[in-house]
Amino acid sequence: VLPRWRQQWSGSGTTSRFPETVLARCVKYTEVHPEMRHVDCQSVWDAFKGAFISKYPCNITEEDYQPLVKLGTQTVPCNKTLLWSRIKDLAHQFTQVQRDMFTLEDMLLGYLADDLTWCGEFNTFEINYQSCPDWRKDCSNNPVSVFWKTVSRRFAETACGVVHVMLNGSRSKIFDKNSTFGSVEVHNLQPEKVQALEAWVIHGGREDSRDLCQDPTIKELESIISKRNIRFFCKNIYRPDKFLQCVKNPEDSSCLSGI
């Protein structure tokens, strides 16, 4: 039997054992987070699957993910939201130690999809493990990109109090308007709920004594935020090594003091 013709995309295919991984992550998450114990993981998987299975993978919409978003509804306490841009690992290491702060990937939906790729095929119930659309080379309305846009928008919309964002001071564009933070989250913070955005600019090392809060891209971020009637603050963080030290040894009393 000849294999059926399959669309060839430029991006890597669906992560192997994708359904099993999502289901297992859901079960693990709901076991660890008592406030999410009511969640039925089979329903979550069905809603996730329903967002992209048998749909043309370049024509996915935020609407497709609404059933999943509804099932994964979760709130973060005020002042405890941590956004990040181009510095994911450090942000996650931070919230692993500072347990009362949360990135999107610390929430159920972000946790389910973190580092995974997925797509289906039009008019079949199959998952495409060979290739999936690349955001640049194929299309932006692909299952993965639309998922992150959807959940990032929701995460930003529900944030309240003082919101923090961790930015990578080693990059040429410390604030990038084209990042998920710059294109989605910044514009969906709600001025009536969010008093301020505080940026933490993480320096490459102790030797870099510059004031990166003066960087033109940070000034651009400040302008965008201020125009939305949200106050903006920025801090230089010179000690990424302190993060790593605390991740290795979170009981160390030098890691337990306030931010």
Epitope: F94, H203, D211, F233, R239, S254, G258, I259
Partner: antibody, heavy 121, light 106 residues
């Protein structure tokens, strides 16, 4: 409780050398970066030098670079400051201080009582 | 390096509020700590990370930091608060302000 006790201060002639020690107790010494901070008579505080928890990285104020060497012996819970080519302007009380901090910043939560170094002919 | 400037002295009546400033170019972009030092004694940390109080430090001590000025506020100042106060920041190296002598009148 945390205790830092400095020793080794005294009177020394310009160009001379001195080695300060700081004996630490009441905490896991090898988990903390340590620093020396000095205070000239009637003046303010000046950071002198710092060393990472395992001694792999050392840092110096420009005013002492090339003349002072910071080191530590974690097996003895002791911090050292080797001071060479001493000048009159190095006259000060030298404090040993533990570097504490959150992920975001650093400060000195614990200080010794200090040891006086006088450089004079 | 950032330079931190403090007034040499501040006077306050007992029970009143004392404010000690620490100015520096865009100091709000850096975290600031404050130390109290009494004559013949080692410094004591009273505020860290702009506004956090270590355990054992009375609630009357508070801190703020924005723009070009960080401020240590002592509300209901007591005679025992008379001391020198130093601000400190970090930008890859530790920097201290010149110190402020707080005098409690009376």
């Amino acid at each position: 409780q945390v205790q830092l006790v400095e020793s080794g201060g005294g009177l020394v002639q310009p160009g001379g050398s001195l080695r300060l020690s700081c004996a630490a107790s009441g905490f896991t010494f090898s988990s903390y970066a340590m620093n020396w901070v000095r205070q000239a008579p009637g003046k303010g505080l000046e950071w002198v030098s710092g060393i990472s928890s395992w001694g792999s990285s050392t840092y110096y104020a420009d005013s002492v670079k090339g003349r002072f060497t910071i080191s530590r012996d974690n097996s003895k819970n002791t911090l050292y400051l080797q001071m060479n080519s001493l000048r009159a302007e190095d006259t000060a009380v030298y404090y040993c201080a533990r570097e504490d901090g959150s992920y975001m910043t650093d400060y000195f939560a614990y200080w010794g009582q200090g040891t006086l170094v006088t450089v004079s002919s | 390096d950032i330079e931190l400037t403090q007034p040499p002295s501040v006077s306050v009546a007992p029970g009143q509020t004392a404010r000690i400033s620490c100015s520096g170019d865009n100091i709000g972009h850096y975290y600031v700590s404050w130390y109290q030092q009494k004559p013949g004694q080692a410094p004591v940390l009273v505020i860290y990370s702009d506004s956090n109080r270590p355990s054992g430090i009375p609630e009357r001590f508070s801190g703020s930091n924005s723009g070009n000025t960080a401020t240590l506020t002592i509300s209901g100042t007591q005679a025992e608060d008379e001391a020198d106060y130093y601000c400190q920041s970090y930008n890859g190296t530790y920097v201290f302000g010149g110190g402020t002598k707080l005098t409690v009148l009376g």
